[in-house]
């Protein structure tokens, strides 16, 4: 190899200057006793190289690129050889930004997968390989004092979420959680969350059903629907409050919300609806009296209100 490039830094802030040096060894000067070293960034020739012969007979050219505005480019030094350029050496230059502080870090405890799933927004594009690590520790108090560290959680490439498995969690005890972003230009850390995994629990929704008609029960009035639901069994012992939403299947009506439902009601008579109309209904629940996340809405139940009411029945709720 006749030439060698060295650069002040192969990775710089986008728009920053970069200085490079290309040295041609003496034993290559048979190419030309006074070779003129040329510089090229990508496909473009770059003027401004300052060339000198060093005391050991090698030739050196130094160039300063005042602003590196490409996020990725190859810088090469070359000699004119006949009618073509002879590339002596090239280096890859990268330019970008240090990682912004990851923001909107939030977590939820999934009791089905027994894991704490945390997600965040990584911030603007850095144009550089940037790694994100979810870091955490156990804490007896309010996360001012750090207890046992928990194994780092590294998301798959391109993902902005990570799952901490149950074996690294302690329920009913606080954890300090934050995201660290790192690339060649720097490191940043999100603000720390301090949470008990159970306080971010997300339940599965109940399963909505139509109430089985019984001979002694009064049939629903016109404009009423009798509903029941089966709680999500693994969350049975968690106090919950729930809410229903409904809308007519036909037309453009938006969802109407009903709730909170009477605590522990597993059946409900919903009234004030249009008679002889098909409705779509869904239910969702949240841990009650303690923090938590709303469940997703349940699968839809489709029911039709009755045609007209028998005159002797009164509207009532089941508690």
């Amino acid at each position: 190899e006749c030439g060698h490039i060295s650069v002040s830094a192969p990775i710089v802030h986008l728009g920053d200057p970069i200085t490079a040096s290309c040295i041609i060894k003496q034993n290559c000067s048979h190419l030309d006793p006074e070779p003129q070293i040329l510089w090229r960034l990508g496909a473009e020739l770059q003027p401004g190289g300052r060339q000198q012969r060093l005391s050991d007979g090698t030739q050196e050219s130094i160039i300063t690129l005042p602003h590196l505005n490409h996020t990725q480019a190859f810088l090469s030094c070359a000699l004119n050889w006949g009618n073509s350029l002879q590339i002596l050496d090239q280096v890859e230059l990268r330019a970008g930004y240090p990682p912004a502080i990851p923001h909107n870090l939030s977590c939820l405890m999934n009791l089905t997968t027994s894991s704490l799933i945390c997600q965040w927004e990584p911030g603007p594009e850095t144009h550089l390989p940037t790694s994100f690590t979810l870091k955490s520790f156990k804490s007896r108090g309010n996360c001012q004092t750090q207890g046992d560290s928990i194994l780092d959680c590294v998301p798959k490439d391109g993902q902005s979420h990570c799952s901490i498995p149950r074996k690294h969690l302690l329920l009913y005890q606080n954890m300090g959680i934050w995201v660290q972003a790192e690339n060649a230009l720097g490191t940043s850390m999100s603000p720390q969350l301090c949470l008990d995994p159970m306080d971010v629990v997300k339940l599965e929704p109940p399963m909505l059903r139509t109430m089985d008609p019984s001979p002694e029960a009064a049939p629903p009035q016109a404009g009423c629907l009798q509903l029941s639901w089966e709680p999500w069994q693994p969350g049975l012992h968690i106090n919950q409050k729930c809410e229903l939403r409904h809308k007519p299947q036909r037309g453009e009506a938006s969802w109407a919300l009903v709730g909170p439902l009477p605590l522990e009601a597993l059946q409900y008579e919903l009234c004030g609806l249009l008679p002889a109309t098909a409705y779509t209904l869904q239910i969702r629940c949240i841990r009650w009296a303690l923090p938590g996340h709303w469940s997703d809405w349940s699968p839809s139940l489709e029911l039709r209100t009755t045609e007209r009411a028998p005159t002797h029945h009164h509207h009532h709720h089941h508690h």
């Epitope: 089905t112 012992h237 106090n239």
Partner: antibody
Framework: EVQLLESGGGLVQPGGSLRLSCAAS????????MGWVRQAPGKGLEWVSS????????PYADSVKGRFTISRDNSKNTLYLQMNSLRAEDTAVYYC???????????WGQGTLVTVSS | DIQMTQSPSSLSASVGDRVTITCRAS??????LNWYQQKPGKAPKLLIY???NLQNGVPSRFSGSGSGTDFTLTISSLQPEDFATYYC?????????FGGGTKVEIK
């Protein structure tokens, strides 16, 4: 300190009835599920019934369904188990326990012995 | 109903031994598995909840692991006060069910 104290056990003839009570203290009783677990002499543990915080949900073991009724009085911080149509196989120590959110029992009362015999 | 099968039903061990008790569920129960210790004439005491969470005040020599259908309670170094009967219990769905128990005796 959380404490649970059962009472009401004793000797009863087959077909008879008994009402067990469990007095709770040291925690907000009205926020927790409660349950009864029994243990026949020399045998393992068997869940009997549980009751939700407001009393609206009351699952039972098949072996006692239709004969036993669980209830609670949140104003008195007391859990009950009404046992009717008692059988010899209902003979056991009956424990009341507070249920954790994910269904574990902690703590337990000291237990009360129910003997069904003629 | 979910059946819980504990093994062994009894074991003999010495102080300082590492002891492992297993519990198998007849169907998947995620992490809804709890472990209890019971000494003769006493009420059971919760050791581990949700498969691996150590209850407050329980010595760290007790640990729980597993998920789905297979679970393990491990006592890393058996102490004289650990000789007792141990029960697993599933809380995934009602009826709540217990394993048959494992009696840990002095060798």
């Amino acid at each position: 300190e959380v404490q649970l104290l059962e009472s009401g056990g004793g000797l009863v003839q087959p077909g008879g009835s008994l009402r067990l009570s469990c007095a709770a203290s040291g925690f907000t009783f009205s926020l927790y599920w409660m349950g009864w677990v029994r243990q026949a002499p020399g045998k393992g543990l068997e869940w009997v019934s549980s009751i939700s915080s407001s009393g609206g949900v009351t699952p039972y073991a098949d072996s006692v369904k239709g004969r036993f009724t669980i209830s609670r009085d949140n104003s008195k911080n007391t859990l009950y188990l009404q046992m009717n149509s008692l059988r010899a196989e209902d003979t056991a120590v009956y424990y009341c326990a507070k249920l954790g959110e994910l269904g574990w029992f902690d703590p337990w009362g000291q237990g009360t012995l129910v003997t069904v015999s003629s | 109903d979910i059946q819980m099968t504990q093994s062994p039903s009894s074991l003999s061990a010495s102080v300082g031994d590492r002891v492992t008790i297993t519990c198998r569920a007849s169907q998947g129960i995620s992490s809804y598995l709890n472990w209890y210790q019971q000494k003769p004439g006493k009420a059971p005491k919760l050791l581990i909840y949700y498969a691996s969470n150590l209850q407050n005040g329980v010595p760290s020599r007790f640990s729980g692991s597993g998920s789905g259908t297979d679970f393990t309670l491990t006592i890393s170094s058996l102490q004289p006060e650990d000789f007792a009967t141990y029960y697993c219990q599933q809380s995934y769905s009602t009826p709540l069910t217990f394993g048959g128990g494992t009696k840990v005796e002095i060798k």
